[in-house]
Amino acid sequence: GSTVPPMVNVTRSEASEGNITVTCRASGFYPWNITLSWRQDGVSLSHDTQQWGDVLPDGNGTYQTWVATRICQGEEQRFTCYMEHSGNHSTHPVPSGNSHHHHHHHH
């Protein structure tokens, strides 16, 4: 099939006092092989500080996955989610506390 770019969505949730979990979700993409990872100040976080979901079919012939990490509240602006898929790439910021979702569809 032809390439379908992912929709990338970054969310935040309270983890514990002073910490938040930021989750980057990619959905609706084809083929399955996608790079999704967190960066701090533009530098990759180690694997052991990130949690990944499996790449799973979403029932529409495309795929979905996610990556999450825990960060200190107030440092959100230092973190970005990086995506590579089928020769394209993009970075996605953590939304500020008063907004909840950032959606980006990439072509």
Partner: antibody, heavy 120, light 107 residues
Framework: QVQLKESGPGLVAPSQSLSITCTVS????????VNWVRQPPGKGLEWLGM???????DYNSALKSRLSISKDNSRSQVFLKMNSLQTDDTARYYC??????????????WGAGTTVTVSS | DIQMTQTTSSLSASLGDRVTISCSAS??????LNWYQQKPHGTVKLLIY???SLPSGVPSRFSGSGSGTDYSLTISNLEPEDIASYYC?????????FGGGTKVEIK
Amino acid sequence: QVQLKESGPGLVAPSQSLSITCTVSGFSLNGQGVNWVRQPPGKGLEWLGMIWGDGSTDYNSALKSRLSISKDNSRSQVFLKMNSLQTDDTARYYCARGAHYGKRWYFDVWGAGTTVTVSS
Amino acid sequence: DIQMTQTTSSLSASLGDRVTISCSASQNINNYLNWYQQKPHGTVKLLIYYTSSLPSGVPSRFSGSGSGTDYSLTISNLEPEDIASYYCQQYSKLPPTFGGGTKVEIK
């Protein structure tokens, strides 16, 4: 068919800088990372750093002050520059494509390597 | 940095033998481990990724296992073309680090 090929100077004088080019084919540098790894004679492998599809770089902190990795997507080339070479930088230098899919991160295709000798 | 130790630097085995190569990490690396084969002339090839996954084109006589800090690569039926050095590599933490290698020779 994915291929990577390193080209370097062969011989570098101590305190001078090293420049190596990795020319790739069969994939786009815009969408996958390339790593640099070296191997001193008779020793093991050492990861130097990498460049991602968007041009961001990660370096081995032990060498970060001397290293620079860049690329030219249109020419399908990745460049390694290392400053202030000493004799213990004598090694075979490899570039390798990085595959980073969730929990999996590996170097799936390697170049043949180029030998660099630091000597006066 | 995480230290990777391959205690056996070289071993001799007969064709058809089952060969096991061990690798230990200085801390838990959560299965974030790959194995590479380096032929005597220097060519490097990915053999196993994420502890036990086999890339396409790698013969099924190669297998990997382990968890925590201890991992192994097994060649179930040694062939002449398996004469090479084998390196483990962790990617749990940056920088990725390699073991010192195990050279496999024919008796």
